[in-house]
């Protein structure tokens, strides 16, 4: 009985097609795979970026996968042939692995780079990133920003730069269609009459880093005796209600009274009759139900109530 | 549909160089290994290198091992030769052509005829 | 390197008559064998892979067979259009080879 062997796949590889970080792994069938044609031979896939402490695994039928690294590391990935037990009646068979690498070869010391980068997606709309430019670098030292997401046929650059002294030092990105609840990739790269640059990679998704405005028409309410309602619009925009967090900050008679976080518009206070002034403020942020993370807007602009009896009237700003 | 199209046909002179190159659409350019082939007149076909889809990947024979170098732009789903120090016995036709997923060739260009003459 | 050797050199034969030609490996190459057809002033055109698997568009009337070391390339009926040279490669190991090709006439 002749033991059944497999070999491994053949120009196992990392493509880059230019996306900033999302790579292609791609390989070629074995040798002599087709004394295997009956029987779906499957391919056991493990990469991670250089310094990792897990692999990601996929078992595929596939010669390809695609997935998003970080650039600023180097990525590992290996590979082995699977011979399921219905080919080989008995136990399954696995070929020897197969590995390969791949890294961006650094430009410049880590110094060079942009620091303190920072993006936000203001009200789900607007995208700016900012960033400062590296340490030591001279004037004549200018960065420039690409990006690429899901949809895009190749990486766009920035056209409309934020500038400080002639440096560009941010980005306004233009109308962002289809881009949110995937990866966003971003390169800042510069150059230099005096020295090269690093490069700087960043992946993000849009709705994890959504800043909304803050609430409107702030709206006191008597519901009773001793309860207040208080009540707020959710902010002009594409987000919908279902979206908001928000925080409530009430001062009564300059007393902070409570910080609430609530998922409507409403809060309701209970009060006493000895109250000459309340007043409060809302800050909406993105929730779970949308996102997996986000930024608190500004404060709401304050509404207040002093003077007159909350139990015969009905405050509006 | 599948094609490739190779650049013109070349006239050198023994000694010197030459960059042939291979257009394709059709398929996903960068998910296929590509090849070389060359034929000179009346003779069998001759392997000249291979390319993986990425790049990474390069194999000639010894024959033309140094002299010859394959490259591709997956950027522009094109493919090239770069012929140096060329020789006489290097005239030939040479087609470019698609590996399949098993090093058999599956399309083939329409040729371009290398004379390497003095 | 692996040398492919082809016979017969040339193969004249009548139209509708089933026709063979054979490809000896100097060494193993498992089933690791391709067979092209060459038409007068064209490029070669893929027919078999894997020494018997057609690819597609290719007509019933070709097949392969064969492992090892031997190879053969079968046509059931020869049509007009199969005037051509036929070629074997191996792709068992690098440099992969060719056959020396088999003219197929019409007598």
């Known amino acids: 009985d002749t033991e059944i062997k497999v070999n491994p796949p053949q120009d196992f590889e990392i493509v880059d097609p230019g996306y900033l970080g999302y790579l292609y792994l791609q390989w070629q069938p074995p040798l002599s795979l087709d004394h295997f044609k009956e029987c779906t031979v499957e391919y056991e896939l493990k990469y991670r970026n250089i310094g990792s402490e897990t692999w990601k695994t996929i078992i595929t039928k596939n010669l390809h996968y695609k997935d998003g690294f970080d650039l600023n590391k180097g990525i590992e990935a290996k590979i082995h042939t699977l011979l399921p037990w219905q080919c080989t009646n008995g136990s399954e068979v696995q070929s020897s692995w197969a590995e390969t690498t791949y890294w961006i070869s650094p430009q410049g010391i880590p110094e060079t780079k942009v620091q303190d980068m920072d993006c936000v997606y203001y009200n789900w709309q607007y995208l700016l990133c900012s960033w400062k430019p590296g340490i030591g670098v001279l004037l004549d030292t200018n960065y420039n920003l690409f990006y690429w997401y899901e949809g895009l046929d190749h990486a766009l650059q920035c056209v409309d730069y934020i500038k400080a002294d002639g440096q560009n030092i941010g980005c306004r990105f233009p109308y962002l269609e289809a881009s949110d609840y995937k990866d966003f990739y971003i390169c800042v790269n510069g150059s230099s009459e005096n020295k090269p640059i690093r490069s700087s990679y960043f992946t993000f998704q849009l709705q994890n880093i959504v800043k909304p405005l803050p609430p409107v028409y702030l709206t006191f309410t008597r519901e009773s005796s001793c309860e207040i309602k208080l009540k707020w619009s959710i902010p002009l925009g594409p987000i919908p209600a279902r979206c908001f967090d928000y925080e409530i900050e009430i001062r009564e008679d300059d007393t902070t009274l409570v910080t609430a976080t609530v998922e409507n518009e409403t809060y309701t206070l209970k009060t006493t009759n000895e109250t000459r002034q309340l007043c409060f403020v809302v800050r909406s942020k993105v929730n779970i139900y949308c996102s997996d993370d986000g930024i608190w807007s500004e404060w709401s602009d304050k509404q207040c109530w002093e003077g007159e009896d909350l139990s015969k009237k009905t405050l509006l700003r | 549909q599948v094609k490739l199209v190779e650049s013109g046909a070349e006239v050198v002179k023994p000694g010197a160089s030459v960059k042939l190159s291979c257009k394709a659409s059709?398929?996903?350019?960068?998910?296929?290994?590509m090849s070389w082939v060359r034929q000179a007149p009346g003779q069998r076909l001759e392997w000249v290198a291979t390319i993986s889809g990425g790049g990474s990947y390069t194999y000639y024979p010894e024959s033309v091992k140094g002299r010859f170098t394959i490259t591709r732009d997956n950027s522009t789903s094109t493919l090239y030769l770069e012929m140096r120090s060329l020789r006489s016995d290097d005239t030939a036709v040479y087609y470019c052509?698609?590996?399949?997923?098993?090093?058999?060739?599956?399309?083939w260009g329409q040729g371009t005829l290398v004379t390497v003459s003095s | 390197d692996i040398v492919m050797t082809q016979s017969p050199l040339s193969l004249p034969t009548t139209l509708g008559q089933p026709v063979s030609v054979s490809c000896k490996a100097s060494?193993?190459?498992?089933?690791?064998v391709a067979w092209y057809q060459q038409r007068p002033g064209q490029s070669p055109r893929a027919l078999i892979y894997s020494a018997s698997y057609r690819y597609s568009g290719v007509p019933d009337r070709f097949s392969g067979s064969g492992s090892g070391t031997d190879f053969t390339l079968t046509i059931s009926r020869v049509e007009a259009e199969d005037v051509a040279v036929f070629f074997c490669?191996?792709?068992?190991?690098?440099?992969?080879?060719f056959g020396g090709g088999t003219k197929l006439e019409i007598k």
């Open positions: 490669q191996q792709y068992n190991a690098y440099p992969l080879t």
């Open positions: 059709g398929f996903t350019f960068s998910s296929y290994g």
């Open positions: 052509a698609r590996r399949d997923l098993r090093s058999a060739m599956d399309y």
């Open positions: 060494q193993n190459v498992d089933i690791n």
